[in-house]
Amino acid sequence: RPSFSLVEDTTLEPEEPPTKYQISQPEVYVAAPGESLEVRCLLKDAAVISWTKDGVHLGPNNRTVLIGEYLQIKGATPRDSGLYACTASRTVDSETWYFMVNVTDAISSGDDEDDTDGAEDFVSENSNNKRAPYWTNTEKMEKRLHAVPAANTVKFRCPAGGNPMPTMRWLKNGKEFKQEHRIGGYKVRNQHWSLIMESVVPSDKGNYTCVVENEYGSINHTYHLDVVERSPHRPILQAGLPANASTVVGGDVEFVCKVYSDAQPHIQWIKHVEKNGSKYGPDGLPYLKVLKHSGINSSNAEVLALFNVTEADAGEYICKVSNYIGQANQSAWLTVLPKQQAPGREKEITASPDYLE
């Protein structure tokens, strides 16, 4: 029995080839311990700027100074490392810019050597120049989500430097990753800063974190591995997307849904609506409206853009993706604020992906 009543039906049309995506790395700012760091929020025309670190609101304190579009950290320590965001709240919309702060003795990543999959060359490191760990080749680490067919070999790399030479260890889902945790174990090639798992199976799915540390600091990086069984599979949606958003009346907002599907996916953006003053049909099922779907006349179905929003646009937006095998859907909420209230990026909480079995 259908779980909803469609207010606006759509027919399936030929769509664009499936998108295989990767998650990009935010810009990285490096500071040495004890130094001051100043970052300018790279957003234009900001009326109000709010800051977060690792998703938590950042306010001024004795070491953190927030002046206009600038964030200053005085006497930086490794604890200041993390993912920062500045949200510019304008009269009509809001925009968020993300960046990483890495408090380390490392020189800028522009001085990294080119990695040719061989051992990183640390011989030139001056033994007197003590350094906390730092990434030497962030390009090798940009692809965070790896969707790999079963039976393939997976290699995760975290090329790093430091003095003394850092050590590397690996966690799976936040816990120590032991050889006995998988049949056939795994290989760690310290000179390549890599973890290698051969012949992956579905139980290898999860988050893999490299922790690189020495006595001066610790850095880490997480990869997500999805093992695609060697049989047709349902669409996979990137966790955390679409993300909750807020804007003021008259503002614009975008929801993004990232899809991985070998089979041609059909993407629909759906919203709960009212019909004749009711949210539910005579059968007790909610009324849903298809706002956008992939097809010949639809550009970039992974993005739903709403312009000049009104209070009526507030609510839950569902990204529903189907292929001939099955479906997956995730949703996000739009909060529409009165014009005088400046919005901030909400904590990104989404419905659990339904593709997990």
Partner: antibody
Framework: QIQLQQSGAELVKPGASVKMSCKAS????????MHWVKRTPGQGLEWIGL????????SYNQKFKGKATLTADTSSSTAYMQLSSLTSEDSAVYYC???????WGQGTSLTVSS | DIQMTQSPSSMSASLGDRITITCQAT??????LNWYQQKPGKPPSFLIY???ELAEGVPSRFSGSGSGSDYSLTISNLESEDFADYYC?????????FGAGTKLELK
């Protein structure tokens, strides 16, 4: 192992309706589409439609709209197809197949005859 | 609807032969194509998916190739159990559509 067990052969009169079943085991029934396919000597294989058991979403081949009705019961991991207003043209073997059309039921033979 | 033109409709071959069956779609189907084998009184059996991927348990003498709108199934070194009907299926767009089938007979 994955199995799709279909109901037995049917002999029905023209104008009647029939409801056949397909019981799934060995996988998470609700998270895979269930397809239905018709096989006749003259027409070969024809896709009738699909149902997504988790929410009851259906998609039909226009040719079979009004002829076939697909339903699913997640509590028993069983999919159903009802065929109405039967004629001799509906005599065929009907298969259910899991989402990727990778696993198929053994087929239900339908004969429409007076 | 996407039409799938399968050829030949029937063919004869000997044990040990190498044969090729083709399917042409009326538009680009981006490798969204499966191949099936069917024997009398049995349901179709899954051979190849996404045009080139061999399904679990299928002998390596079966292979799929193609892209765009043109696809083929090749069986090298034919064995006695390979004589059957073969169908292609496109799943790029609903309604899903099958080729008309190829009957492979022993010469």
């Amino acid at each position: 192992q994955i199995q799709l067990q279909q109901s037995g052969a049917e002999l029905v009169k023209p104008g009647a309706s029939v409801k056949m079943s397909c019981k799934a085991s060995g996988y998470t029934f609700r998270y895979y589409n269930m397809h239905w396919v018709k096989r006749t000597p003259g027409q070969g294989l024809e896709w009738i439609g699909l149902i997504y058991p988790d929410n009851g979403d259906t998609s039909y081949n226009q040719k079979f709209k009004g002829k076939a009705t697909l339903t699913a019961d997640t509590s028993s991991s069983t999919a159903y197809m009802q065929l109405s207003s039967l004629t001799s043209e509906d005599s065929a073997v009907y298969y259910c197949a899991r989402g990727g059309l990778d696993y198929w039921g053994q087929g239900t033979s339908l004969t429409v005859s007076s | 609807d996407i039409q799938m033109t399968q050829s030949p409709s029937s063919m004869s071959a000997s044990l040990g032969d190498r044969i090729t069956i083709t399917c042409q779609a009326t538009q680009d189907i981006v490798k969204n194509l499966n191949w099936y084998q069917q024997k009398p009184g049995k349901p179709p059996s899954f051979l190849i998916y996404y045009a080139t991927e061999l399904a679990e348990g299928v002998p390596s003498r079966f292979s799929g190739s193609g892209s765009g709108s043109d696809y083929s199934l090749t069986i090298s070194n034919l064995e006695s159990e390979d004589f059957a009907d073969y169908y292609c299926l496109q799943f790029y767009e609903f309604p899903l559509t099958f080729g008309a089938g190829t009957k492979l007979e022993l010469k």
